[in-house]
Interface confidence: low
């Protein structure tokens, strides 16, 4: 099939980085500066993406692949292919229409992006709070209150007692 196609369509011989110029006898012409074609047999070259303003160039455009952008420090990418840059906030904050705001009590955000999320409710799993949550960190759940009651059996066996004066081998 490929062989048949290339015999019928001269453009299939044009590699990535070129375009097949139908106006000029289907000749393979190189993509002009600041354009690319990522596959063979293309009739046109696409204009390279330009990473301007809050965007910065992560990967230069080449004749066969588009430029890739990321965001300048203080911003992070959103959307497919980093189509938008959104302002960073500090840990313990979330971005609102009015800018970065501290997480409300009972919520946290351990990243510079995203929203504040509720602390884990340890009691739902029958556990107790071992370490309290903060604006930046979730709570740490510990053993259930029953596990801490006197006489309760432990799942892990106790470590063997050592004789005084003997260091472990």
């Amino acid at each position: 099939f490929e062989r048949t196609r290339s015999l019928q369509d001269p453009c299939s011989n044009c590699p990535a980085g070129t375009f097949c110029d139908n106006n000029r006898n289907q000749i393979c012409s190189p993509c002009p500066p600041n354009s690319f074609s990522s596959a063979g047999g293309q009739r046109t070259c696409d204009i390279c993406r330009q990473c301007k303003g809050v965007f910065r160039t992560r990967k230069e455009c080449s004749s066969t692949s588009n430029a890739e952008c990321d965001c300048t420090p203080g911003f992070h990418c959103l959307g497919a292919g980093c189509s938008m840059c959104e302002q960073d906030c500090k840990q313990g904050q979330e971005l609102t229409k009015k800018g970065c705001k501290d997480c409300c009590f009972g919520t946290f955000n351990d990243q510079k992006r995203g929203i504040c999320r509720p602390w884990t409710n340890c009691s739902l799993d029958g556990k107790s709070v071992l370490v309290n949550g903060t604006k930046e960190r979730d709570v740490v759940c510990g053993p259930s209150p029953a596990d801490l009651s006197p006489g309760a059996s432990s799942v892990t066996p106790p470590a063997p007692a050592r004789e005084p004066g003997h260091s472990p081998q």
């Epitope: 590699p15 990535a16 980085g17 070129t18 110029d21 000029r24 000749i27 393979c28 012409s29 190189p30 993509c31 002009p32 500066p33 690319f36 230069e60 455009c61 080449s62 004749s63 066969t64 692949s65």
Partner: nanobody, 126 residues
Framework: EVQLLESGGGEVQPGGSLRLSCAAS????????MAWFRQAPGKEREFVSR?????????YVAESVKGRFTISRDNAKNTLYLQMSSLRAEDTAVYYC???????????????????WGQGTLVTVK
Amino acid sequence: EVQLLESGGGEVQPGGSLRLSCAASGWAFGNYGMAWFRQAPGKEREFVSRLAWNGGSTDYVAESVKGRFTISRDNAKNTLYLQMSSLRAEDTAVYYCARQRSYSRYDIRTPQTYDYWGQGTLVTVK
């Protein structure tokens, strides 16, 4: 004034290696595709390899040099290179670097696609 100056040619034994350089001046080197051609005595100028304006992937290499010759460029130094290895007697020729036109109606393997040429450097394999 646009100038291209090749260097690095010389005599080498079969199986040997050479690295040709092409120093460009007088224009924005990084904005143009570049190519190497060669011309053996009594023969037409032959396409060797071409590299896109920004050093992207090499989209054309002559079958006769595939796997032996590598084209590269350093836009900061305004220089084009041709690393030649496993040289054969039939590689003997004058090697030219050339600047690609911004737009051409010709195939990129044809000399008409290129508007400026160096004076050439002779490579002899024997």
